[in-house]
Amino acid sequence: CKAMHVAQPAVVLASSRGIASFVCEYASPGKATEVRVTVLRQADSQVTEVCAATYMMGNELTFLDDSICTGTSSGNQVNLTIQGLRAMDTGLYICKVELMYPPPYYLGIGNGTQIYVIDPEPCPDSDF
């Protein structure tokens, strides 16, 4: 297993609709054809997997149908979007990149993007 540098923004504020996007960029030492991207959430010392996708270079990222993540790739950059976020989902979102094929296997883990989420103000009830 060889180490690889992964860069991501330090902090992002999610939109009022609970959507946060950020770029995860990795310094690919070779010509990888198969890449796996995993988003981990660290909160209160607990680390949980948010979503993961494996993709072939030049193709779209495919997350599971029920995933809260979507993404696109361009060269050594992955543009990740996490949706359906609420205030309780505020935390450090860490990008993990694995170059699966061809060998050698490379692993890189970013420092994390702190995502802040604000629950929207409830709309006042209106009578019609």
Epitope: P9, A10, V11, V12, L13, A14, S15, S16, S21, F22, A43, D44, S45, A87, T90, L92, N111, G112, Q114, Y116, I118
Partner: antibody
Framework: QVQLVQSGAEVKKPGASVKVSCKAS????????INWVRQAPGQGLEWMGW????????NYAQKFQGRVTMTTDTSTSTAYMELRNLRSDDTAVYYC?????????WGQGTLVTVSS | EIVMTQSPATLSLSPGERATLSCRAS???????LSWYQQKPGQAPRLLIY???TRATGIPARFSGSGSGTDFTLTISSLQPEDFAVYYC?????????FGPGTKVDIK
């Protein structure tokens, strides 16, 4: 090295607006947020809100909602804070401060005096 | 909103003495999101401690932070003349971010 350089002192009349700038250097501006914090004479630190330079999204303290606007110009790595309808109790030193995983670097502060 | 309280409001000590400053949050704060700042008259605040216990770059070892949940402490093991200042704790665990009212450490 990381630096946040703020605009100079301002004297304003009640009801006017003020726009304070904060020019960042020494780091990738869009990877961080900018907080605005003020300090009235002899008082403590009061958080006003912050802007995510990555996407321009903002979050303001309830007290300032509707009266403050925070913006960034990523081409010049500069953040702005505009406060409208100034009152005498808005007299304070206004600080910008960088937010990553925590607030680390601060500007030197801008004194805004509101007086008739 | 998480309300931060600090005690005592003023601490009068002599150089060489140990200073213990307390910060309490109205609800639990993950220690990763608790910072301490020092402010001297006419100057901007300076980051001392982040993540409740990690010293910022260039901060002397006499400054240490501890605590978890709702109770946090800043300790200055042996006060130096340049340490007499106001100290603030701050949380960025939840929006809105909030500061404590400060503890003034002055010369006895």
């Amino acid at each position: 090295q990381v630096q946040l350089v703020q605009s100079g002192a301002e004297v304003k009349k009640p009801g006017a607006s003020v726009k304070v700038s904060c020019k960042a250097s020494g780091y990738t501006f869009t990877n961080y947020g900018i907080n605005w914090v003020r300090q009235a004479p002899g008082q403590g630190l009061e958080w006003m809100g912050w802007i995510s330079a990555y996407n321009g999204n903002t979050n303001y303290a309830q007290k300032f909602q509707g009266r403050v606007t925070m913006t960034t110009d990523t081409s010049t790595s500069t953040a702005y804070m505009e406060l409208r309808n100034l009152r005498s109790d808005d007299t304070a030193v206004y600080y910008c401060a960088r937010l990553g995983h925590y607030i680390d670097y601060w500007g030197q502060g801008t004194l805004v005096t509101v007086s008739s | 909103e998480i309300v931060m309280t600090q005690s005592p409001a003023t601490l009068s000590l002599s150089p060489g003495e140990r200073a213990t400053l307390s910060c309490r949050a109205s609800q639990s704060v993950s220690s990763s999101y608790l910072s301490w700042y020092q402010q001297k008259p006419g100057q901007a605040p300076r980051l001392l401690i982040y993540g409740a216990s990690t010293r910022a770059t260039g901060i002397p070892a006499r400054f240490s932070g501890s605590g978890s949940g709702t109770d946090f402490t800043l300790t200055i093991s042996s006060l130096q003349p340049e340490d007499f200042a106001v100290y603030y704790c701050q949380q960025d665990y939840n929006l809105p971010f909030t500061f404590g009212p400060g503890t003034k450490v002055d010369i006895k």
